[in-house]
């Protein structure tokens, strides 16, 4: 139940007043305001927007709003020396060149400073060679190529279609396969939904549209030159050769018109199966090289981008808590965009703006939250989650002692079908209870709750009558808070119907066509889905900041821990002989999970019964809840990934966007049959089981009676 000793407004009225103050029309207005010009990280335009947001948050009534700046490594194309890819003939003449920029959307022809499509942090280079088509460039795609088809990518330029996994993982895989360049393209199979027109007549990707994006493999490091520490005025910076996560080969993205011209000439091996074929009218031959008539032609990349240390600006707003000002609930989302940011990030930033305005309105009427709420407009998310990570590095001691929860607020929509939530198990019950109180915006669910429409459209695969809630992965600003610091985190947005739309993300993601009009015409004309997302995000923040007892249920962690233990055990049991040979046992892990379950159950009973009027006991119980997520942090981090420290969850080593459970054990088991030293490999599995079992047991003990 929401409550606050610092105000005479009734508890229910607080939450209702907050939610009722949120208006779709305001979100629409804010989105328009944020999307009229590009706001690329490190540019003057994005600095000006930071100052505008600072000013408006102050007007809305926050106690303080400050800019926090850092000097981080960013990447930009060379304005006078554009990036492109050529097909060259035997004389070295360029007989075809890929586009230099996207055709601008209607009404934006005269906008300056639209950054052309590029792969941020690509090194410079002009490699030329034969092409190899590598499907999505996933780990399993390279296994298929190298192990089954015996195709060697060494010294080749590979072309991979976007989708399925984070682009940085594609580049890493290509590097490991020996490629000397990577071309990324958007295939209509993944970015063109059947029956929908291309922008500007619909929400599909036109042939000239291109997805921008960074290709780093930071593994949570933040600024590549200052891993672990803030990129402040007195920072010691690594040399570029020692920078974290930079790719070593040139990379460039193209649209499907250009891809057609490269792929139509491909020769060599046929695609291994239908899963390697997209929707272009090309054979999807793997190569290497072009077919007979064109076999003397090669592909040449021309990449001239530069890496530059550049100033970025976060906006940090504070609404001081009345009772527990030293407990922080954080709502954060990024402000920087690749171009106009119609969806990513401004559909999220507009929602944050309206949430701040609503909280400010309540504060002006004399209300305060129980706990402090911090609002953040992060910079340079698109360049590797840099703004959020640098701020968290600078404030890590405060955050690890005072951080209650982090709610992320990037894109509010990636579709308009149903709700999508990824969060810590501690927040499951909060999300369930909140969505039962909110109205569904969906057609056919008038008068029904959001919980009902969400559950109907996106049912849990395990529990009937409940909605699907996914694991947190990465690729967004919650990463440092959850994966490094162990602060309970969650995110919510409206999504597409994954069953009928099998394209990756939304078609116009990171293209010039991600405009205000895209949202207003095609995704959410009434801004009702944006309003619902504002209610979910804002409602979560409200409850986390205002409820007397933190709205965390540790029993839900117990349930998933058992599920994850079962899953990793079944993976291991695919190797029964080796488990026997090397005496691999999961007994310690299952025992720890059992102990956790029992202790969590007892803790929950005590939570119902304790004297909530005793502030010391209340604080003690709340601290046990707050620090539970922290207890899953291993200070030593995961193998070769020191900034991924959560033992239960980490971004997948094969796809940064996806979450993996018991990642230490999972990675130790991955492809173990191919390891040259099985004894060493199974020894590492045993060590990871030990780390996991210890961590779960240690976390359980934080919930035991304190004395």
């Amino acid at each position: 139940k929401s409550s606050n000793e610092a105000t005479n407004i009734t508890p229910k009225h607080n939450m209702k007043a907050f939610l009722d103050e949120l208006k779709a029309e305001n979100i629409k207005k804010f989105l328009y305001n944020f999307t009229q010009i590009p706001h690329l990280a490190g540019t003057e335009q994005n600095f000006q927007l930071a100052k505008q947001i600072q000013s408006q948050w102050k007007e809305f009534g926050l106690d303080s709003v400050e800019l926090a700046h850092y000097d981080v490594l960013l990447s930009y194309p060379n304005k006078t020396h554009p990036n492109y890819i050529s097909i060259i003939n035997e004389d070295g003449n360029e007989i075809f060149n890929t586009s230099l920029f996207e055709p601008p959307p209607p009404g934006y022809e005269n906008v300056s400073d639209i950054v052309p499509p590029f792969s941020a942090f690509s090194p410079q280079g002009m490699p030329e060679g034969d092409l190899v088509y590598v499907n999505y460039a996933r780990t399993e795609d390279f296994f298929k190529l190298e192990r089954d088809m015996k195709i060697n990518c060494s010294g080749k330029i590979v072309i991979a279609r976007y989708g399925k996994v984070f682009r940085g993982n594609k580049v890493k895989n290509a590097q490991l396969a020996g490629a000397k360049g990577v071309i990324l393209y958007s295939d209509p199979a993944d970015y063109f939904a059947p029956g929908v027109k291309s922008y500007p007549d619909g929400w599909n990707l036109p042939g000239g549209g291109v997805q921008r994006g960074n290709i780093l493999n930071l593994n949570g490091a933040g600024d590549p030159l200052t891993p672990g520490y803030p990129a402040n005025e007195y920072a010691y910076r690594r040399g570029i050769a020692e920078a974290v996560g930079l790719p070593s080969i040139p990379v460039h993205p193209i649209g499907y018109y250009d891809a057609q011209k490269l792929l139509e000439k491909m020769g060599g091996s046929a695609p291994p199966d239908s899963s390697w074929r997209g929707s272009l009218k090309v054979p999807y031959n793997v190569g290497p090289g072009f077919t007979g008539n064109f076999s003397t032609q090669k592909v040449k990349m021309h990449i001239h981008s530069t890496n530059e240390v550049t100033r970025i600006y976060n906006v940090i707003g504070t609404l001081r808590g009345a009772v527990e000002p030293d407990r922080y609930v954080i709502l954060g989302g990024h402000r920087d965009s690749w171009v106009f940011g119609g969806i990513d990030p401004q559909s999220g930033a507009a929602v944050v703006h309206e949430i701040v305005r609503s909280f400010g309105t309540l504060k002006k009427e004399g209300w305060r939250p129980r706990r402090t709420i911090l609002f953040a407009s992060w910079d340079a998310e698109e360049f590797g989650l840099l703004g959020s990570t640098e701020w968290a590095e600078e404030n890590s001691r405060l955050l690890q002692e005072r951080g209650v929860a982090y709610i992320n607020a990037d894109s509010s929509i990636e579709g308009n079908y149903t709700l999508r939530v990824d969060c810590t198990p501690l927040m499951y019950s909060l999300v369930h209870n909140l969505t039962k109180e909110l109205k569904s915006p969906d057609e056919g669910f008038e008068g029904k709750s959001l919980y009902e429409s969400w559950t109907k459209k996106s049912p849990s695969p395990e529990f009937s009558g409940m909605p699907r809630i996914s694991k947190l992965g990465s690729g967004n600003d919650f990463e440092v808070f959850f994966q490094r610091l162990g602060i309970a985190s969650g995110r919510a947005r409206y999504t597409k119907n994954w069953e009928t739309n099998k394209f990756s993300g939304y078609p116009l993601y990171h293209s010039v066509y991600e405009t205000y009009e895209l949202v207003e015409k095609f995704y959410d004309p009434m801004f009702k889905y944006h309003l619902t997302v504002a209610q979910v995000r804002g409602g979560m923040v409200f409850e986390l900041a205002n409820s007397i007892v933190l709205p965390f249920d540790c029993r839900d962690y117990a349930v998933v821990l058992r599920k994850y233990a079962d899953k990793i055990y079944s993976i291991s049991m695919k190797h029964p002989q080796e488990m026997k040979t090397y005496s691999v046992s999961f007994d310690s892990l299952f025992s720890a999970v059992k102990n956790f379950t029992e202790i969590a159950s007892k803790f929950s009973e005590r939570l119902q019964d304790f004297d909530k009027s005793n502030p010391i006991v209340l604080r003690m119980m709340n601290d046990q809840l707050m620090f539970l997520e922290r207890a899953f942090i291993d200070p030593l981090g995961l193998p070769d990934r020191p900034f991924y420290r959560h033992v239960i969850y980490a971004p997948s080593s094969h796809n940064k966007y996806a979450g993996e459970s018991f990642p230490g054990i999972y990675d130790a088991l991955f492809d173990i049959e191919s390891k040259v030293d099985p004894s060493k490999a199974w020894g590492e599995v045993k060590r990871q089981i030990y780390v996991a079992a210890f961590t779960v047991q240690a976390a359980a003990e934080t919930l035991s009676e304190v004395a």
Epitope: Y84, F96, N97, T98, S99, L100, F101, E102, P103, P104, P106, E109, P206, G207, G208, G209, G255, Y257, D258, Q260, K261
Partner: nanobody, 123 residues
Framework: EVQLVESGGGVVQPGRSLRLSCAAS????????MNWVRQAPGKGLEWVAF????????YYADSVKGRFTISRDNSKNTLYLQMNSLRAEDTAVYYC????????????????WGQGTMVTVSS
């Protein structure tokens, strides 16, 4: 109103040069590939040259390759054809034509044509 207006034609001696212009209005030139097409007296249409919307690709008919250069200035919404070493067989009405498809990388179907400008190469 969507239109293309050619200019710069005239009478020129063999071996001399001429520069044709095509001013676009009513649509954003920056989004479309553009073409020059010609029609010699009593003959059919002959495609001459193509330039992609961003200027990254230029293609020419074999008959003009090495002599003609297609270019564009998107900020001025104007297409150009620089014609050098002109020959008698270059005598024709020259039309500029807009590609139908936004962002096409090679010549496609043409949906908007100018009224043409006459070029006469004669001594």
């Amino acid at each position: 109103e969507v239109q293309l207006v050619e200019s710069g034609g005239g009478v020129v001696q063999p071996g001399r040069s001429l520069r044709l212009s095509c001013a676009a209005s009513g649509f954003p030139l920056i989004s479309y590939g553009m073409n020059w097409v010609r029609q010699a007296p009593g003959k059919g249409l002959e495609w001459v040259a193509f330039i992609s919307y961003d200027g990254s690709n230029r293609y020419y008919a074999d008959s003009v390759k090495g002599r003609f250069t297609i270019s564009r200035d998107n900020s001025k919404n104007t297409l150009y054809l620089q014609m050098n070493s002109l020959r008698a067989e270059d005598t024709a009405v020259y039309y500029c034509a807009k590609d139908r498809i936004v962002g096409a990388r090679v010549p496609d179907a043409f949906d908007i044509w100018g009224q043409g400008t006459m070029v006469t190469v004669s001594s």
